[in-house]
Interface confidence: low
């Protein structure tokens, strides 16, 4: 972007202040929350979201667990410590000094503890479980267009390669998306499985984070795929740390 | 739904410069990349150079480096490609094409419909 | 530069025919290989991309397989359509670089 032009904003994320003031008055645009400069080619970190998204609501969820090591975020909405790369801290702390660890997605992956606790690397969430139901349709979706559709809304909304799309799983009205992405896996200038479901759960619950573009319009040959329940599991290349008292 | 319109045929002399534009549609123009590809009359495809249309950084195969300028104009979604001190090897039709950014994704899955651009004396 | 080298430079097959066209890079270029198809005045089509992924819209048979240094597409039961060039190209490092082509011909 030039200066003179006046389209300067963020395609990727609309929760960004932009202005051309980048080199060669090039568009350049920060998150809001944070001021840290988004690259606007490919989808925000959840974390800069995160922070950015501050002043939302906050939401709690369980259901029962589909492995005994996978995560659910209960605790909802918390302003994060992002760091340069826009990567969750290993450790997060509150403003009365309660800290815990987390994994790549931010998800809360210790007991809570104080300014002493340790959290020595930032575990990578390799495994994402994105559970929807869907609204009644007349009949069942044709599980091979539903998972090509599904597929196609990754790979093409979100830009995440369909090597890191493992499955798509059906049981009217139950569908499941499996993300699985090693760190081995992950080459530079690769969508991150956390970054893409958490747009994707975003655009869900019709709050989508892109920039001008319509909300998530999904249908399967015409026919809309209208979700009323959502739920996501994160699974860690670590197990998680809880004592046996939060597991019972 | 997603188009490259490129602009039309050029006649030009050895030694002189065209430009050939293509102009982008249905898609967010700086969420994907720009490549351009030629093709001579009977021969294979050849990749010129590409553009993160998002940073405005070009990168050019070093066949061109110093005869060929990539450049695009967010405002107008549009792609440029200049080639400069034209000969008759020059003759051949110029390919848009769209791409992502990371090397996991620098396939071309929309294209123009092609420019020729014929050098003769 | 990495040199993707096809083969056979021309194929002659029927409708109906399986039919299989080869590519080598001169080193490894892990699974990023994509491969286009193109008709006589017309510009290239994307089939498949990252070795084995078929593009949105293109007919399941055709398929891709390999890694490494050594890539197949395969065309399971030729369609009258399906007479064409056929390139492949590397999307692993820049320059990209392409096949010199296989020209599909009817027996």
């Known amino acids: 972007h030039t200066a003179a032009q006046d389209n300067c904003t963020c395609p990727t994320n609309k929760m960004t202040v932009c202005s051309p003031d980048g080199p060669g008055g090039r568009c350049q645009c920060r998150a809001l929350g944070s001021g840290m400069a988004v690259d606007c080619s490919t989808l925000t970190s959840k974390c800069l979201l995160l922070k950015a998204r501050m002043s939302a609501p906050k939401n709690a969820r369980t259901l029962v667990r589909p492995s005994e090591h996978a995560l659910v975020d209960n605790d909802g909405l918390y302003d994060p410590d992002c760091d340069p790369e826009g990567r969750f801290k290993a450790r997060q702390c509150n403003q009365t000094s309660v800290c815990w660890c987390v994994n790549s997605v931010g998800v809360r992956r210790t007991d809570k503890g104080d300014l002493s606790l340790r959290c020595d690397e930032l575990v990578r969430t390799h495994h994402i479980l994105i559970d929807l139901r869907h609204r009644p349709t007349a009949g069942a979706f044709n599980h091979s267009d539903l998972d090509a559709e599904l597929r196609r809304l990754f790979r093409e909304r979100y830009r995440l390669h369909p090597k890191f799309v493992a499955a798509v799983h059906y049981e009217q009205p139950t569908i499941q998306i499996e993300l699985r992405q090693n760190t081995s896996q992950k080459a530079a200038g690769d969508v991150d499985i956390g970054d893409a479901a958490y747009y994707f759960e975003r655009d869900i619950k019709g709050e989508s984070l892109f920039q001008g573009r319509g909300g998530l319009d999904l249908r399967v040959r015409g026919e809309p795929l209208q979700v009323e329940r959502t739920l996501i599991y994160y699974l860690d290349e670590i197990p998680p740390k809880f004592s046996m008292k939060r597991l019972t | 739904q997603v188009q490259l319109v490129q602009s039309g045929a050029e006649v030009k002399k050895p030694g002189a410069s065209v430009k050939v534009s293509c102009k982008a549609s249905?898609?967010?123009?700086?969420?994907?990349?720009m490549q351009w590809v030629r093709q001579a009359p009977g021969q294979g495809l050849e990749w010129m150079g590409w553009?993160?249309?998002?940073?405005?950084?070009?990168k050019y195969a070093e066949d061109f480096k110093g005869r060929v300028t990539i450049s695009a104009d967010t405002s107008t979604s549009t792609a440029y490609l200049q080639l400069s001190s034209l000969k008759s090897e020059d003759t051949a039709v110029y390919y848009c094409?769209?791409?992502?950014?990371?090397?996991?994704?620098?396939?071309?899955?929309?294209w123009g419909q092609g420019t020729l651009v014929t050098v003769s004396s | 530069d990495i040199q993707m080298t096809q083969s056979p430079s021309s194929l002659s097959a029927s409708v109906g025919d399986r039919v299989t066209i080869t590519c080598k890079a001169s080193?490894?270029?892990?699974?990023?290989v994509a491969w286009y198809q193109q008709k006589p005045g017309k510009a290239p089509k994307l089939l498949i991309y990252?070795?084995?992924y078929r593009y949105t819209g293109v007919p399941s048979r055709f398929s891709g397989s390999g890694s490494g240094t050594d890539f197949t597409l395969t065309i399971s039961s030729l369609q009258p359509e399906d007479f064409a060039v056929y390139y492949c190209?590397?999307?692993?490092?820049?320059?990209?670089?392409f096949g010199q082509g296989t020209k599909l011909e009817i027996k």
């Open positions: 094409a769209r791409s992502g950014f990371g090397s996991s994704y620098w396939y071309f899955d929309v």
């Open positions: 249905g898609y967010t123009f700086t969420t994907a990349g």
């Open positions: 553009i993160n249309t998002h940073h405005g950084v070009p």
């Open positions: 080193q490894d270029v892990s699974t990023a």
């Open positions: 990252s070795a084995s």
């Open positions: 190209q590397q999307h692993y490092i820049t320059p990209l670089t």
